[in-house]
C-alpha cells in the first residue's frame, strides 16, 4: 500500500532525526500541504533552513565538526536577506565562524557545502579579506559598517552558526 509505505518512511526519517534532536518545532506552511516543516526546537527557521547559534568557543575545524554531529554545517550565506535574518540572533560583541574558508591561503574561498563562491554575493567588511594566513571567515559587528565578514586565523576559538535543511514530516 503506497500510503502505508510513505508513512513508514516518514516515521523512520523522524526516528533517525530525533537521535540528534529529541524535540522538534513544526509549522504548517500552507493550507493544502500535508507535511509539517520542522526544525529542532531551540533552532530558528528562515525559508527552507534551520539555524543554531553555538555559543561555545572553538576553532573553525571543531566548530564545523560540532555542526556536523547535529546533522548540519557551518552556515553558508546565500543572500542579503538570509544574512539579515541571521544577524537578528547575534550579539554585537561576539564573532561567529561561517562555513567559508580558504584552505590553501590563495584566496580561493570555498563554502563547506560546495556552494560556488560568488564574489557578487559576499559581505566582507571594507579592506577584508586582508591576510593570506587568515584562512577562515567570521561574521562580526563593526560600528562603522554594521555586520560583515572578516578573515581570521582558523585556530582562534570563536562562536559559530550552524545551518541545516528543514525536515518535512
Amino acid at each position: 500500500n503506497f500510503m502505508y509505505s510513505k508513512t513508514v518512511k516518514r516515521l523512520s526519517k523522524l526516528r533517525e532525526y530525533q537521535q540528534y534532536h529529541p524535540s522538534l518545532t513544526c509549522v504548517m506552511e500552507g493550507k493544502d500541504i500535508e507535511d509539517w516543516s520542522c526544525c529542532p526546537t531551540p533552532w530558528t527557521s528562515f525559508q527552507s533552513s534551520c539555524y543554531f547559534i553555538s555559543t561555545g568557543m572553538q576553532s573553525w575545524t571543531k566548530s564545523q565538526k560540532n555542526c556536523s554531529v547535529m546533522g548540519a554545517d557551518l552556515v553558508v550565506i546565500n543572500t542579503r536577506e538570509e544574512q539579515d535574518f541571521i544577524i537578528q540572533n547575534l550579539k554585537r560583541n561576539s564573532s561567529y565562524f561561517l562555513g567559508l574558508s580558504d584552505p590553501g591561503g590563495r584566496r580561493h574561498w570555498q563554502w563547506v557545502d560546495q556552494t560556488p563562491y560568488n564574489e557578487n554575493v559576499t559581505f566582507w567588511h571594507s579592506g577584508e579579506p586582508n591576510n593570506l594566513d587568515e584562512r577562515c571567515a567570521i561574521i562580526n559587528f563593526r560600528s562603522s559598517e554594521e555586520w560583515g565578514w572578516n578573515d581570521i586565523h582558523c585556530h582562534v576559538p570563536q562562536k559559530s552558526i550552524c545551518k541545516m535543511k528543514k525536515i518535512y514530516i
Epitope: L14, S23, L24, C26, I33, E34
Partner: nanobody, 123 residues
Framework: QVQLQESGGGLVQAGGSLRLSCAAS????????MGWFRQVLGKEREFVAA????????YYTASVKGRFTISRDNDKNTVYLQMTSLKAEDTAVYYC????????????????WGQGTQVTVSS
C-alpha cells in the same frame, strides 16, 4: 468518556499575555497528541498549535509561531497555551482538542473537543 475543559480566557490589551489551560479527564490524554484551535464568529475553526504525546514535537500555525507556546503536563492531564504579544486578530473562541494518535499530519482532525474559552484582545 473523555472530557476537555478549557480555562484562562479573558479580555487583554494588545501586546499582553494570557495562558490557557485544558484539563482532560479520562484515559485518552497520555498517549494522544493534543491541540488548540480557534474560531471567529462566522468563520471556520482553525488550527493554532498542537503537541505530540511525549512533547517531542510541537506544531504551530505560521501566524502564532514565536508568540504562542504549547506545552503539556502528563501527570496533571493538562495542556497549556501560553500566548504573548497578543494582537486584535487573535480574538476568538479557543478550543482544546484531543487526537486519536500520538503525532499528527496537517490534515489530521481531532476526535475530541472542549467547549471553548473566549479570548478578546482590545487594541
Amino acid at each position: 468518556q473523555v472530557q476537555l475543559q478549557e480555562s484562562g480566557g479573558g479580555l487583554v490589551q494588545a501586546g499582553g499575555s494570557l495562558r490557557l489551560s485544558c484539563a482532560a479527564s479520562g484515559r485518552i490524554f497520555s498517549n494522544s497528541a493534543m491541540g488548540w484551535f480557534r474560531q471567529v464568529l462566522g468563520k471556520e475553526r482553525e488550527f493554532v498549535a498542537a503537541i505530540s504525546e511525549n512533547s517531542s514535537i510541537l506544531y504551530y500555525t505560521a501566524s502564532v509561531k514565536g508568540r504562542f507556546t504549547i506545552s503539556r503536563d502528563n501527570d496533571k492531564n493538562t495542556v497549556y497555551l501560553q500566548m504573548t504579544s497578543l494582537k486584535a486578530e487573535d480574538t476568538a473562541v479557543y478550543y482544546c482538542a484531543g487526537y486519536g494518535s500520538t503525532t499528527i499530519r496537517t490534515t489530521t482532525r481531532p476526535t475530541k473537543w472542549g467547549q471553548g474559552t473566549q479570548v478578546t484582545v482590545s487594541s
